[in-house]
């Protein structure tokens, strides 16, 4: 039960995280015009990974796409790449994890296969989350660098006679969405990996140990032996932990094949 819950929760958290990564990637507000200690302009500028927008005081908004590939900063291209890789890995991870879910039966899929798929999706979610966090962090670092550069020469002009308003940009909403989403995907991935450990079938070694007593030959086969670690050589298809306190008799009992839906 606990394994199913962990796996299910990991899937849901990852799903929310990947939806957030997609949303952040598509959002226009990666960087927004800094309004603090600046002349109050009648226009508000903000930029995304794919286009920049200007909102006038009247509400009129105009967005222009970056219709060049080579003319864009390498850092922006890197951020785009990281976010896209994160989305692709996350999407594949979601696809894999759907089939790996313990609550879904697909033919006669072995638990070992489900465990492997859960681990694979978990790793994909972790990498996806890391890609998103890295992408957002690279962009944030770029913003901070540019912010202080533009602060240094807030007003540039010809002998101080004509002043140019330097538009400074600060963190936009997409950065926070990206960080949170990346974190959720990462957490979801970790949960999937944890669930995988619980799904992994235990291999039982039936090694007979013979004790030769005087006049008798008795072979003791430790069929009901349980490994103290919880991950040792248990009986086939045995669930390690179900999250609830149970009697020793319950622990000893074997699950039927119908316990796995």
């Amino acid at each position: 039960m606990a394994v199913t819950a962990c796996q299910g929760l990991g899937f849901v958290v990852s799903l929310i995280g990947i939806a957030g990564i997609i949303a952040a990637t598509c959002m226009d507000q990666w960087s927004t015009q800094d309004l603090y200690n600046n002349p109050v302009t009648a226009v508000f500028n903000y930029q995304g990974l794919w286009r920049s927008c200007v909102r006038e005081s009247s509400g009129f908004t105009e967005c222009r796409g970056y219709f060049t590939l080579l003319g864009l900063p390498a850092m922006l291209q890197a951020v785009r790449a990281l976010m896209i890789v994160g989305i692709v890995l996350g999407a594949i991870g979601l696809l894999v994890s759907i089939f790996a879910l313990k609550c879904i039966r697909i033919g006669s899929m072995e638990d070992s296969a489900k465990a492997n798929m859960t681990l694979t999706s978990g790793i994909m979610f972790i990498v996806s989350g890391l890609c998103a966090i890295a992408g957002v962090s690279v962009f944030a670092n770029m913003l901070v660098t540019n912010f202080w550069m533009s602060t240094a020469n807030m007003y540039t002009g010809m002998g101080g006679m004509v002043q140019t308003v330097q538009t400074r940009y600060t963190f936009g909403a997409a950065l926070f969405v990206g960080w949170v989403a990346g974190g959720l995907t990462l957490i979801g991935g970790v949960m999937m990996c944890i669930a995988c450990r619980g799904l992994a079938p235990e291999e039982t070694n039936y090694k007979a140990v013979s004790y030769h007593a005087s006049g008798h030959s008795v072979a003791y086969k430790p069929g009901g032996f349980k490994a103290s670690t919880g991950f040792g050589s248990n009986t086939k298809n045995k669930k390690i932990y179900d999250g609830g306190a149970r009697t020793e008799d319950e622990v000893q009992s074997y699950p039927s094949k119908h316990d796995y839906v």
């Epitope: 015009q33 002349p39 109050v40 302009t41 009648a42 226009v43 500028n45 903000y46 930029q47 920049s52 927008c53 200007v54 006038e56 005081s57 009247s58 509400g59 009129f60 105009e62 222009r64 004509v162 002043q163 140019t164 308003v165 538009t167």
Partner: antibody, heavy 118, light 113 residues
Amino acid sequence: QVQLKQSGPGLVQPSQSLSITCTVSGFSLTYYGVHWVRQSPGKGLEWLGVIWRGGNTDYNAAFISRLSINKDNSKSQVFFKMNSLQPNDTAIYYCARAAYYGNCFDYWGQGTTLTVSS
Amino acid sequence: DIVMTQSPSSLTVTAGEKVTMSCKSSQSLLNSGNQKNYLTWYQQKPGQPPKLLIYWASTRESGVPDRFTGSGSGTDFTLTISSVQAEDLAVYYCQNNYIYPLTFGAGTKLELK
């Protein structure tokens, strides 16, 4: 067609307040902002403030302490009030519609001529 | 506040003549986000409120004759009337629409010779 009609007093005594109502037709105040501008022989055209479609306002810092702009969308009316008037506030006061783009004023009221005198 | 300086203060012209008037701002009116200049030109005839002619420094308002042309960028702007007509006699104002408070120039008065 778009129209802005102003109503207000022509003569106000010093230290009194000025109230002008700008009644609009041909458009809705829920979609457009309304600016207020005055024109005096000494200072030319001066922007005073604006009330945006959402009800938020921006004022000229020089008038912020004695100026208030409000509106009633249902009545299509914008209310302008300026306190503590002095003779140098004598001017023609205009309301003007904020154009949807360009941050400019595309339609103007006929103007309210104000004289501040005792 | 941004200071808008218009020159000349008055122009005496003959009908059919080409006219140019200048407007300079103390700060750049160019917005880097959309590469648009937030400068507007108005025409005001005696006893009337100002009328919008040109916004974004060079975009003509609908219904404005194409003899009116706005140009310039940053801090220097020009309004050109390719062939002055009698009905063009008025005062022309430029306005900063970029930084609050929005400010106007003192105007250029166009008079007939």
